[in-house]
């Protein structure tokens, strides 16, 4: 892979360990955690960045769902298995065998269970709803100028082809960026847009996950856009199955 | 409008030091994001580093991390690159650059040609004992 070869590291994923040991004396790179061959020309998968962040401190957060079959990850971080691609696989059990079924971006669909709960396939994620809440600026953002800056970033930062990148909404102070991708749209060497979005959250949390390369400073127009709240709402291609004890909660 | 222009070039022996200076005028230099690129004769201009607005988040290639420095005094309108150890390959025509777009800040954007508007004529630097 194009990893940098003066001094062999990773630039998508500061979290591996790089070596030039592959073919010809190649710099590889291996995800932290899992120890799996990453490619370093695009980003890593969730699942690898998760497992390789699974000490850090546990993110919880409630939120307010847009639809009925939206997920947001109240669960938080968790240590993931993810298959030999580095997707996440279907079923997830924690040390004490509790297990639950989860979508293309590792978050729960299904209520918790046994050992005997069945997770037949990964249902995908098509559609991600990033939320955004930017600190009050002196006037609002021009519309125009915020969606070509926010696409922009996400062709170039994150190399996700801006067919989907569906639609950038704002009205002061809420930006909404709706990435809509399905499993027929997305063809071979095609950034995820899970994945994509996940980048992006860490970014905004000044939690950059790109080696060397830098923070994030997001301005339109020369204002600064300094964003104060994130949630995130993922919509899975066949709804979610939570008992209605979870749903009237 | 903004006119750039680069000084500080010249004749160095490997691992001596320079500083190149490039002098900005025309726009409110403070709200510019800029950036060093380089040519060498017989190859394609490119990045050399790159520095945001408030002049945090130096970006640099990796041919010249730990011997470059990037850094900007807005009071005087003016963008600096301190080269230390230098080498034979860095010999080039050094070119300043910036970007008025007002846009965000990050490594794929800052290096990045097409990123910037406005280019100085740039400052030659060879490096040979």
């Known amino acids: 892979h194009t990893a940098a070869q003066d001094n062999c590291t990773c630039p998508t994923n500061k979290m591996t360990v790089c070596s030039p040991d592959g073919p010809g004396g190649r710099c590889q790179c291996r995800a932290l955690g899992s120890g799996m061959a990453v490619d370093c020309s695009t980003l890593t998968s969730k699942c690898l960045l998760l497992k390789a962040r699974m000490s850090a401190p546990k993110n919880a957060r409630t939120l307010v769902r847009p639809s009925e079959h939206a997920l947001v990850d109240n669960d938080g971080l968790y240590d993931p298995d993810c298959d030999p691609e580095g997707r996440f696989k279907a079923r997830q059990c924690n040390q004490t065998s509790v297990c639950w079924c989860v979508n293309s971006v590792g978050v729960r669909r299904t209520d918790k269970g046994d050992l005997s709960l069945r997770c037949d396939e990964l249902v995908r994620t098509h559609h991600i709803l990033i939320d955004l809440r930017h600190r009050p600026t002196a006037g609002a953002f021009n519309h125009s100028d915020l969606d070509a800056e926010l696409r922009r970033l996400f062709r170039e930062r994150y190399r996700l082809h801006p067919k989907f990148v569906a639609a950038v909404h704002y009205e002061q102070p809420t930006i909404q960026i709706e990435l809509r991708q399905n499993t027929s749209q997305k063809a071979a060497g095609d950034v995820d847009i899970g994945d994509a979005a996940y980048y992006f959250e860490r970014d905004i949390k000044g939690e950059s996950l790109f080696q060397g390369r830098g923070g994030l400073d997001l301005r339109v127009r020369g204002e600064p856009l300094q964003v104060e709240r994130t949630l995130i709402y993922y919509l899975d291609e066949i709804p979610p199955k939570f008992s209605m004890k979870r749903l009237t909660a | 409008q903004v006119q750039l222009l680069e000084s500080g070039g010249g004749l160095v022996q490997p691992g001596g030091s320079l500083r190149l200076s490039c002098a900005a005028s025309?726009?409110?230099?403070?709200?510019?994001?800029m950036g060093w690129f380089r040519q060498a004769p017989g190859k394609e201009r490119e990045f050399v580093s790159a520095?945001?607005?408030?002049?945090?988040?130096?970006t640099y290639a990796d041919s010249v991390k730990g011997r470059f420095t990037i850094s900007r005094d807005n009071s005087k309108n003016t963008l600096y690159l301190q080269m230390n150890s230098l080498r034979a390959e860095d010999t080039a025509v050094y070119y300043c650059?910036?970007?008025?777009?007002?846009?965000?800040?990050?490594?794929?954007?800052?290096?990045?040609?097409?990123?910037?508007?406005?280019w100085g004529q740039g400052t030659l630097v060879t490096v040979s004992s």
């Open positions: 520095i945001s607005w408030t002049g945090a988040n130096p």
């Open positions: 650059a910036a970007d008025t777009s007002g846009g965000s800040y990050y490594y794929e954007r800052a290096t990045a040609e097409t990123s910037y508007d406005y």
């Open positions: 025309g726009r409110t230099f403070s709200s510019q994001s």
